[in-house]
Interface confidence: low
């Protein structure tokens, strides 16, 4: 190698200066006695080296480009050859900007997974290659006092979530958690959370079934329907609360919404509804008394009302 | 309760070398960054390096860069400083100290003394 | 790097005063200010971190404020072990660098 590169900082601020600085080895004087070292930020000559021989008889050539404008860019020096340039040596340059701090970190408990899942925005481009990392610790008070601290779950690349497994959480016990983003430029921290994973449980919907006719049971008046859900109970009871919501499948009516519903339903009656429509029902469930989420709605059920009855019979049916 | 305990530090010449160790017991190590810290006779602390739970992130100090090396042992709860090419300027009280997870240097060991001189 | 700038370096004080030291970072760190005192010869000891938080086991005569890049330490009333020097911290970033320490000494 006749010449190498040295910088001030590989990685710098975008619109940052950048200095650098490129020696030509004595023996490699052969190539001509006062060599013009000459220097180019990707496929551009750049002005502005100021040259030196040293006292060991190396040559020096430093340069300083007053604002790095490319998020990515090669610099090279090089020495006139004949009709061409010879390249001497090349460094990568990189700029861009520390990141900023994570917001809207939010985690929601999942029971199914035995996990809590916590995402956040990581905020505006860097242009640089940008870890997330999201930490935590237990607490038994208001996250003032630490506890044990939890692994550091690192998202797969280019998610802004990540789950914290089952085994690495105390249950009804506060949590601090909050994201740190590091990247060549810096690191930021996101504010920090305190919560109890249990207070952000998210539960899984109830299943909606019809009821099945039976011939003692009388059948549904018009504009009602029958129907029943049982509760989605993990491994553990949790007390919760309800809410339906329906509408004509048919135009282009809005969701009405039913609630509080009892906790278990074997048999419900929703009446108040169009006669011989079809609807689309959906439920979902809360934790409650306690804090929660709302689940996700249940998957549609899809039921009919009936005719209402001819006059007479209606009239039969108040007698 | 958490105990630190800093040895290796000694007499030693300028451009030689030294491996400070910092036993660590009371908590869970292995889920822990630790730190070095120094303070120079009569002066202030100063920062050196520090270390994630596993090992992967090790920031250094301009001042130590390319020259100390920080490691850690999970396995043996112990926290490592290689300090190579050792200055004048390197003549200090090295601290070993277990972070906490807001970065604050939460318990510290009772220091070790290198003495640079020729 | 963040650095920081501790002030004043010295300050003289009595038994019962209330005693104010200031903590400048050279950008803004949001809350990550850590203080500690130190003992000649001892070790430091975490008091407060994360700006404002007291570390188990300090007395509630210390506290911590301030955001941003200025913060402060108080001592609201002044005890014979509390002349040490002081010192604060950023963990904003990995560079975890100190201020150069405050020495509080007897009036």
């Known amino acids: 190698e006749c010449g190498h590169i040295s910088v001030s900082a590989p990685i710098v601020h975008l619109g940052d200066p950048i200095t650098a600085s490129c020696i030509i080895k004595q023996n490699c004087s052969h190539l001509d006695p006062e060599p013009q070292i000459l220097w180019r930020l990707g496929a551009e000559l750049q002005p502005g080296g100021r040259q030196q021989r040293l006292s060991d008889g190396t040559q020096e050539s430093i340069i300083t480009l007053p604002h790095l404008n490319h998020t990515q860019a090669f610099l090279s020096c090089a020495l006139n050859w004949g009709n061409s340039l010879q390249i001497l040596d090349q460094v990568e340059l990189r700029a861009g900007y520390p990141p900023a701090i994570p917001h809207n970190l939010s985690c929601l408990m999942n029971l199914t997974t035995s996990s809590l899942i916590c995402q956040w925005e990581p905020g505006p481009e860097t242009h640089l290659p940008t870890s997330f990392t999201l930490k935590s610790f237990k607490s038994r008070g208001n996250c003032q006092t630490q506890g044990d601290s939890i692994l550091d779950c690192v998202p797969k690349d280019g998610q802004s979530h990540c789950s914290i497994p089952r085994k690495h959480l105390l249950l009804y016990q506060n949590m601090g958690i909050w994201v740190q983003a590091e990247n060549a430029l810096g690191t930021s921290m996101s504010p920090q959370l305190c919560l109890d994973p249990m207070d952000v449980v998210k539960l899984e919907p109830p299943m909606l079934r019809t009821m099945d006719p039976s011939p003692e049971a009388a059948p549904p008046q018009a504009g009602c329907l029958q129907l029943s859900w049982e509760p989605w109970q993990p491994g553990l009871h949790i007390n919760q609360k309800c809410e339906l919501r329906h509408k004509p499948q048919r135009g282009e009516a809005s969701w009405a919404l039913v609630g509080p519903l009892p906790l278990e339903a074997l048999q419900y009656e929703l009446c108040g509804l169009l006669p011989a429509t079809a609807y689309t029902l959906q439920i979902r469930c809360i934790r409650w008394p306690l804090p929660g989420h709302w689940s996700d709605w249940s998957p549609s059920l899809e039921l009919r009302t009936t005719e209402r009855a001819p006059t007479h019979h209606h009239h039969h049916h108040h007698h | 309760e958490v105990q630190l305990l800093e040895s290796g530090g000694g007499l030693v010449q300028p451009g030689g070398s030294l491996r400070l160790s910092c036993a660590a017991s009371?908590?869970?190590?292995?889920?822990?960054?630790m730190g070095w810290v120094r303070q120079a006779p009569g002066k202030g602390l100063e920062w050196v390096s520090s270390?994630?739970?596993?090992?992967?992130?090790?920031p250094y100090a301009d001042s130590v860069k390319g020259r100390f090396t920080i490691s850690r042992d999970n396995s043996k709860n112990t926290l490592y400083l290689q300090m190579n090419s050792l200055r004048a300027e390197d003549t200090a009280v090295y601290y070993c100290?277990?972070?906490?997870?807001?970065?604050?240097?939460?318990?510290w060991g009772q220091g070790t003394l290198v003495t640079v001189s020729s | 790097d963040i650095q920081m700038t501790q002030s004043p370096s010295s300050l003289s004080a009595s038994v019962g005063d209330r005693v104010t030291i200031t903590c400048r970072a050279s950008q803004g760190i949001s809350s990550y200010l850590n203080w500690y005192q130190q003992k000649p010869g001892k070790a430091p000891k975490l008091l407060i971190y994360y700006a404002s938080n007291l570390q188990n086991g300090v007395p509630s005569r210390f506290s911590g404020s301030g955001s941003g890049t200025d913060f402060t330490l108080t001592i609201s009333s002044l005890q014979p072990e509390d002349f040490a020097t002081y010192y604060c911290?950023?963990?904003?970033?990995?560079?975890?660098?100190f201020g150069g320490g405050t020495k509080v000494e007897i009036k």
């Open positions: 009371g908590f869970t190590f292995s889920l822990y960054w």
């Open positions: 270390i994630s739970s596993s090992g992967g992130v090790t």
């Open positions: 100290a277990k972070l906490g997870e807001l970065g604050q240097y939460q318990f």
């Open positions: 911290q950023q963990s904003f970033q990995y560079a975890q660098h």
